[in-house]
Interface confidence: medium
């Protein structure tokens, strides 16, 4: 996360580190004792379940026990449009035990349309600056806001590549953004409860004023999530 402050896992108990061969690759969000929500692109290089582990319950990257993964479920990847459908569900081999530092985040409502400038939060262990060289050892957080899709698709930004199933978030002047290593983590909105409204997906650089972070819009995939859960009962 770029433009940040340190976070406590007590504040974000649903945040997990998704690791391959003990190396942090992506963030993710606990949805219930068995399921973690993350980004599909985290698994492009490695699709085997066995070397993937999930770490929950700490704001320090290396200090908490790893959990085995039973299944990784991804919507079919489309090589023509590689940024589409950047959403995945990980099923854990054994259910999580909830505590003060391990708790789920709510899914959004089907009709949850957030207007531009709505305040949101981002978290992650990713780079703290563009080309920043390494991950953060501690969980970082930052406040951002919804950026209008029209602005996000402007000539000096993403030129129409932000689809209706994506959303943009940042701050108008830039400088606050998700970055490498934050992928898969939550974009969060607080109403009465915290909702995961977006999944860290893609962007050009980190923190640029005209190219904010682009997030998978979770409300566009609720049917898919519920269908996966139904099939896995």
């Amino acid at each position: 996360v770029v433009g940040v402050e340190e976070a406590s896992v007590d504040s974000w108990p649903w945040q997990v580190s998704i690791q391959y061969d003990k190396q942090h690759v992506c963030g993710g969000s606990i949805l219930d004792p068995h399921w973690v929500l993350t980004a599909a692109h985290c698994f492009r290089k490695h699709t085997d379940v066995f070397n993937w582990k999930v770490r929950a319950g700490s704001d320090k990257l290396g200090s908490f026990p790893s959990l085995a993964v039973a299944k990784i479920i991804i919507i079919e990847f489309n090589p023509m449009y590689p940024k589409d459908n950047d959403i995945a569900l990980m099923k854990l081999q054994f259910p999580l035990t909830f505590s003060g530092t391990v708790r789920p985040i709510c899914l959004p409502f089907f009709d949850e349309e957030l207007t531009p400038a709505t305040p949101l939060w981002i978290i992650g262990w990713g780079f703290t600056k563009q080309n920043g060289g390494k991950m953060s050892d501690i969980l970082l957080q930052a406040s951002v806001q919804v950026i209008d899709s029209t602005r996000c698709n402007a000539d000096d930004a993403y030129q129409g590549e932000v689809t209706e199933k994506m959303m943009c978030a940042g701050i108008p002047e830039g400088g606050v953004d998700t970055c490498q290593g934050d992928s898969g983590g939550p974009l969060m909105y607080q109403s009465d409860q915290w909702h995961v409204v977006g999944i860290v997906s893609w962007g050009y650089g980190c923190g640029g004023p005209s190219t904010p972070g682009v997030y998978t819009k979770v409300s566009a995939y609720l049917n898919w999530i519920y269908n996966v859960w139904k099939a896995e009962l």
Epitope: T47, M80, Y81
Partner: antibody, heavy 123, light 108 residues
Framework: QVQLVKSGGGLVQPGGSLRLSCAAS????????MSWVRQAPGKGLEWVSA????????NYADSVKGRFTISRDNSENTLYLQMNSLRAEDTAVYYC????????????????WGRGTLVTVSS | SYELTQDPAVSVALGQTVRITCQGD??????ASWYQQKPGQAPVLVIY???NRPSGIPDRFSGSNSGNTASLTITGTQAEDEAVYYC???????????FGGGTKLTVL
């Protein structure tokens, strides 16, 4: 400079099979998604299939799904199209194409094209 | 039947400006790309994204979009611009790519 050299076209009977190949040079091959596009004689262009850079993911037009298989060998910088159960309506010039890889634009456009190879399905 | 509709033929006087259009519902959500194809040759990309030209494509070629219509404009048309022009974009499902039927441009 990107070069795409095709082989494998020719005359085949209905129901028969054919494999097209497309050897690429001048491009970091495994970084690019690739595609096949065809053009029936005197007609327009029709997208056929695409494959991701790693080869792990593929996508097909409805007209060829279940009959055609796209694949690639990144060690040989070569793209393939295995065509089975061929029909008269598959008669066309087949082009292989490199999907664009602009930094943040989606890749749904074809940056470089090969010269094309004619496949004729006739008894 | 094409999901993207183009006029079959358009003509233009040498040195004049011509606009070739492409219509389709998917163009409300996605940009078109434009290809030039001369007889016996492979297509060549001339415009992609909102209005991006690959290197080597003259700046007389430009693209624009409005509603369900994408347009390719050639300003100061040259004799060598005579060709068939195809638009392409995502289909209505968003998963596949489709081409328009092509517009044959004749330079008078």
């Amino acid at each position: 400079q990107v070069q795409l050299v095709k082989s494998g076209g020719g005359l085949v009977q209905p129901g028969g099979s054919l494999r097209l190949s497309c050897a690429a040079s001048g491009v970091n091959f495994n970084n690019y998604a690739m595609s096949w596009v065809r053009q029936a004689p005197g007609k327009g262009l029709e997208w056929v299939s695409a494959i991701s850079g790693s080869g792990a993911s593929t996508n097909y037009a409805d007209s060829v799904k279940g009959r055609f298989t796209i694949s690639r060998d990144n060690s040989e910088n070569t793209l393939y199209l295995q065509m089975n159960s061929l029909r008269a309506e598959d008669t066309a010039v087949y082009y292989c194409a490199v999907l664009g890889r602009e930094q943040y634009l989606a890749r749904g456009y074809f940056e470089h094209w090969g010269r094309g190879t004619l496949v004729t399905v006739s008894s | 039947s094409y999901e993207l509709t183009q006029d079959p033929a358009v003509s233009v006087a040498l040195g004049q400006t011509v606009r070739i259009t492409c219509q389709g519902d998917s163009l409300r959500s996605y940009y078109a790309s434009w290809y030039q194809q001369k007889p016996g040759q492979a297509p060549v990309l001339v415009i992609y994204g909102k209005n991006n030209r690959p290197s080597g494509i003259p700046d007389r070629f430009s693209g624009s979009n409005s509603g369900n219509t994408a347009s390719l404009t050639i300003t100061g048309t040259q004799a060598e611009d005579e060709a068939v022009y195809y638009c392409s974009s995502r289909d209505s499902s968003g998963n596949h790519l489709v081409f328009g039927g092509g517009t044959k441009l004749t330079v008078l």
